[in-house]
């Protein structure tokens, strides 16, 4: 899977959208490595 910063940002945006934004406050692109997905 793509693990560039931009891919991580878009994947996280998709995850936030699907979860209705109900995630931890520190669940942001700069804190989340690609392995979190």
């Amino acid at each position: 899977a793509c693990d560039t910063a931009t891919c991580v940002t878009h994947r996280l945006a998709g995850l936030l959208s699907r979860s209705g934004g109900v995630v931890k406050n520190n669940f942001v692109p700069t804190n989340v490595g690609s392995k979190a997905f």
């Epitope: 793509c2 560039t4 996280l12 942001v28």
Partner: antibody
Framework: QVQLVQSGAEVVKPGASVKISCKAS????????MNWVKQAPGQGLEWIGD????????HYNQKFKGRATLTVDTSISTAYMELSRLRSDDTAVYYC????????????WGQGTLLTVSS | DIQLTQSPSFLSASVGDRVTITCKAS??????VAWYRQKPGKAPKALIY???YRYSGVPSRFSGSGSGTEFTLTISSLQPEDFATYIC?????????FGQGTKLEIK
């Protein structure tokens, strides 16, 4: 609203260094990566690198590695790109850009900083 | 580095026309392509991410498709503000790379 505001135009001599700033507002600066992009006159876009404001981590385009240095000052929500050993072919507009998710999911770009390298 | 080749480089069209721009990658980049519109003297403006998703506020006349090595941007009905240069970008691999641009001119 989200804004990236860059420092003003620079005219510098070959061999010198320059540091361009990009001040972010309207979002949490440390949450999103900051990219830097070069556009020479009449030319296409060239990615220089990105910086993680949360920890200072960077990725560089090999073409710029060793001459470009990307840093941040989180206390003033500002990213910097320093370019050293300047040459005439560094004359270009330099942009900062960041993809945010909150408050809005968008790819924001600064207005650009024109760097002219001339003796 | 991944090479992105856009075609055509120049395109003449009229208001109301449907136009399609192609971006070909030298290697498989999955769906990880973005499209930008740039007007002279201005910063690029993001239109599409992940090959086919419009950013918020981008008009529905813009659509993207493709995966792997071939991508397209379609403008269904050209508006006066659409005459500009369109640029694709891949972000699947470092360094991110851009296409050379397609200049869309008024016929």
């Amino acid at each position: 609203q989200v804004q990236l505001v860059q420092s003003g135009a620079e005219v510098v001599k070959p061999g010198a260094s320059v540091k361009i700033s990009c001040k972010a507002s309207g979002y949490t600066f440390t949450d999103y990566y900051m990219n830097w992009v070069k556009q020479a006159p009449g030319q296409g876009l060239e990615w220089i690198g990105d910086v993680n404001p949360n920890n200072g981590g960077t990725h560089y385009n090999q073409k710029f590695k060793g001459r470009a240095t990307l840093t941040v000052d989180t206390s003033i929500s500002t990213a910097y790109m320093e370019l050293s050993r300047l040459r005439s072919d560094d004359t270009a507009v330099y942009y900062c850009a960041s993809i945010t998710i909150v408050p809005v999911y968008f790819d924001f770009w600064g207005q650009g900083t024109l760097l002219t390298v001339s003796s | 580095d991944i090479q992105l080749t856009q075609s055509p480089s120049f395109l003449s069209a009229s208001v109301g026309d449907r136009v399609t721009i192609t971006c070909k990658a030298s290697q498989n980049v999955g769906p990880n392509v973005a499209w930008y519109r740039q007007k002279p003297g201005k910063a690029p403006k993001a239109l599409i991410y992940s090959a086919s998703y419009r950013y918020s506020g981008v008009p529905s006349r813009f659509s993207g498709s493709g995966s792997g090595t071939e991508f397209t941007l379609t403008i269904s009905s050209l508006q006066p503000e659409d005459f500009a240069t369109y640029i694709c970008q891949q972000y699947n691999y470092y360094p991110y790379t851009f296409g050379q641009g397609t200049k869309l001119e008024i016929k």
